[in-house]
């Protein structure tokens, strides 16, 4: 089938990094500067993405692959292919419509992005709290109380209910 197709369509022989040039008898021409074709058989090359403004270049464009962007320092990528940027916060914070806010008691965030999440409730797994949680770190659960001293019991209070965090736009 491939052989038949190439006899019918000479463009199918053009590899990635080239395009099938109708102006030159359908021969395979290299993509011009600042353009690419990531698959074979293309009739045009696409213009490379430019990482400007809030974006900076993570990977340069080549004749066979598009440029890749990330965000300027203090911001991180969101969306398919880094189509937008979002402000970083410190660990122990989350981004709200009013900017970075500290995590409420009973919640934590160990990253510069995302929302504060409730501490693990050790007692649900029959375990006890070995290390208390902070704004930046989850609690560390240890062996169950029964493993430590027979007959003893320890109950970890459940994490407080909270509204889901907002992402500022």
């Amino acid at each position: 089938f491939e052989r038949t197709r190439s006899l019918q369509d000479p463009c199918s022989n053009c590899p990635a990094g080239t395009f099938c040039d109708n102006n030159r008898n359908q021969i395979c021409s290299p993509c011009p500067p600042n353009s690419f074709s990531s698959a074979g058989g293309q009739r045009t090359c696409d213009i490379c993405r430019q990482c400007k403004g809030v974006f900076r270049t993570r990977k340069e464009c080549s004749s066979t692959s598009n440029a890749e962007c990330d965000c300027t320092p203090g911001f991180h990528c969101l969306g398919a292919g880094c189509s937008m940027c979002e402000q970083d916060c410190k660990q122990g914070q989350e981004l709200t419509k009013k900017g970075c806010k500290d995590c409420c008691f009973g919640t934590f965030n160990d990253q510069k992005r995302g929302i504060c999440r409730p501490w693990t409730n050790c007692s649900l797994d029959g375990k006890s709290v070995l290390v208390n949680g902070t704004k930046e770190r989850d609690v560390v659960c240890g062996p169950s109380p029964a493993d430590l001293s027979p007959g003893a019991s320890s109950v970890t209070p459940p994490a407080p209910a909270r509204e889901p965090g907002h992402s500022p736009q």
């Epitope: 400007k52 403004g53 940027c85």
Partner: antibody, heavy 118, light 107 residues
Framework: QVQLQQWGAGLLKPSETLSLTCGVY????????WSWIRQSPGKGLEWIGE???????EYNPSLKSRLTISIDTSKNQFSLKLTSVTAADTAVYYC????????????WGQGVLVTVSS | KIVMTQSPATLSVSPGERATLPCRVS??????LAWYQQKPGQAPRLLIY???TRATGVPARFSGSGSGSEFTLTISSLQSEDLALYYC?????????FGGGTKVEIK
Amino acid sequence: QVQLQQWGAGLLKPSETLSLTCGVYGGSFSTNYWSWIRQSPGKGLEWIGEINHSGNTEYNPSLKSRLTISIDTSKNQFSLKLTSVTAADTAVYYCARMGYHSPSFDFWGQGVLVTVSS
Amino acid sequence: KIVMTQSPATLSVSPGERATLPCRVSQGIGSNLAWYQQKPGQAPRLLIYGASTRATGVPARFSGSGSGSEFTLTISSLQSEDLALYYCQQYNNWPLTFGGGTKVEIK
């Protein structure tokens, strides 16, 4: 809340220089890119160019030879100069802030109608 | 430069009905697209960026979708205050370019 206020001459003769200034009130001036965009009945919305606090500029190639965008960080202002204007430059000119999130425009000035006529 | 095509130029929709506004791009641009609303005598207002993320204060009836070279702005239930011009804008490449706009009017 960020506000952009723009001013400049509204009536020009052919071959004169268009000069507009945009003042930025509220928000952070030094961390954004600032743009000029124009809107004419024939051409719709056309991006003219942009500048950041360091004075780095990007210009629309179609206007580059006649265009200067500058910035005065001490006054929180940026300016547009377009030389050798013709009737084709008649448009409403807007200044706008490029968002933190993407190269789209989240705050706009009120617009100034510039008419080029002999 | 990248060419943005918005068709139809005018869209007539009954109040409460869904309005679907397409934007076609001359090549793939990922999700690097924004939508604006412009009412007479006013500057454009950012509605959507990243193809589908609503800007601050934009009602939930506005939604964006698509990627590559085909994008859509949808107004789920048209209100009288939504009568305006709508523009798409790409930011995959400089110069940044806008579509010619679609005017939404009451049927």
